[in-house]
């Protein structure tokens, strides 16, 4: 399911809880996606030794995965709600092609990979409702995405395993940075 079902077992709701606010719904949606990533990472780590590789060893890759930096306005120093929100939405839109790549990369967690992809689409919709300056959000070019997808799928097995690991790790990190920033809004 693209949206978490009610209160998950990890959360304790007060009796007769009010309906979730927009912020709570976004927070919960991110946590739901993080659960999905965690499950996918388990399968990836069981299949290959990528997870033991250091960050430095994996840094030499040609993937242009979105990353949060101080200039994006999401860090405490220079925090800017609107700039940050634009960065989060833009980053998630950029991740979509990589999430599409993940769709055929899992055997036992195929449904989980689809859930992460669909849940991310829902998250983007939630965030777009929250954003005031939608004009500042640049949508990735479909043609560029299509050729990137073809290129990634043409890699050898080892590189595909590496790519899968890097996407999951970077996406997790991006979501966590986003989660922290959104809680300040």
């Amino acid at each position: 399911a693209p949206v978490p079902p009610g209160e998950d077992s990890k959360d304790v709701a007060a009796p007769h809880r009010q309906p979730l606010t927009s912020s709570e719904r976004i927070d919960k949606q991110i946590r739901y996606i993080l659960d999905g990533i965690s499950a996918l990472r388990k399968e990836t780590c069981n299949k290959s030794n990528m997870c033991e590789s250091s960050k430095e060893a994996l840094a030499e890759n040609n993937l242009n995965l979105p990353k949060m930096a101080e200039k994006d306005g999401c860090f405490q120093s220079g925090f800017n709600e609107e700039t940050c929100l634009v960065k989060i939405i833009t980053g998630l839109l950029e991740f979509e092609v990589y999430l599409e790549y993940l769709q055929n990369r899992f055997e036992s967690s195929e449904e989980q990979a689809r859930a992460v992809q669909m849940s991310t689409k829902v998250l983007i919709q939630f965030l777009q409702k929250k954003a005031k300056n939608l004009d500042a959000i640049t949508t990735p070019d479909p043609t560029t995405n299509a050729s990137l997808l073809t290129k990634l799928q043409a890699q050898n097995q080892w590189l595909q395993d590496m790519t899968t690991h890097l996407i999951l790790r970077s996406f997790k990190e991006f979501l966590q940075s986003s989660l922290r920033a959104l809680r300040q809004m």
């Epitope: 709570e24 993080l34 922290r180």
Partner: antibody, heavy 122, light 105 residues
């Protein structure tokens, strides 16, 4: 196993700058979801949160002390350093460093150092 | 800042008793609450996070609950090693803030 240890001067003079180092092992500050923070406790009083630094170098400070605090990390050395300027006798306290590690960023501090007592006196 | 208040500030109890400590947040903090135990001369020790999640290794006699902005730490059947000071901490908003503590004696 996770360990953290604070080091630094036990006695500082008023107006001086305090530099404390937290050296940790058993985890990496380059792992997403990890943060290391500083908390202090004046003798017989409550805990006071000072600062927190995250894996991605985002830094959060207590607003009342922000102008006096700087937190930095050295991932390769497994160290976090806190500097506090213009020390005053009211800053006399046990200073703790602690770790937070949670995928959902709930910031509960699951491992603490033993603490170091810093006395500010002339 | 989110102000955390704790009651009582101290409580006397005997081994085997059931003890309840309450913590109130000045604004909604959702489930972002942790409880710590501190013994004299020692660092605090995390007992409970996310309102009611028991940290691994913590005895099941400790439990946490929530009602709105009121949070409760309950110790059923008090043991000799439970005599200590207990602090709550909200982790929803920066700055992270602690309660003033409850001394269990």
């Amino acid at each position: 196993q996770v360990t953290l240890k604070e080091s630094g001067p036990t006695l500082v003079k008023p107006t001086q700058t305090l530099t404390l180092t937290c050296t940790f092992s058993g985890f990496s500050l380059s792992t997403s979801g990890v943060a290391v923070g500083w908390i202090r406790q004046p003798p017989g009083k409550a805990l006071e949160w000072l600062a927190l630094i995250f894996w991605d170098d985002d830094k959060h400070y207590s607003p009342s002390l922000k102008s006096r605090l700087t937190i930095t990390k050295d991932t390769s050395k497994n160290q976090v350093v806190l500097t506090m300027t213009n020390m005053d006798p009211v800053d006399t306290a046990t200073y703790y460093c602690a770790r937070s590690y949670d995928d959902y960023l709930y910031y509960a501090l699951d491992y603490w150092g033993q603490g170091t007592l810093v006395t500010v006196s002339s | 800042d989110v102000v955390m208040t704790q009651s009582p500030s101290s409580v006397s109890a005997s081994v085997g008793d059931r003890v309840t400590i309450t913590c109130r947040a000045s604004q909604d903090i959702d489930n972002f609450l942790a409880w710590y135990q501190q013994k004299p001369g020692k660092a605090p020790n995390l007992l409970i996070y996310k309102v009611s999640s028991l940290r691994s290794g913590v005895p099941s006699r400790f439990s946490g609950s929530r009602s709105g902005t009121d949070f409760t730490l309950t110790i059923t059947s008090l043991q000799p090693e439970d005599f200590a000071t207990y602090f709550c901490q909200q982790t929803r908003r920066f700055p992270l803030t602690f309660g003033p503590g409850t001394k269990l004696e």
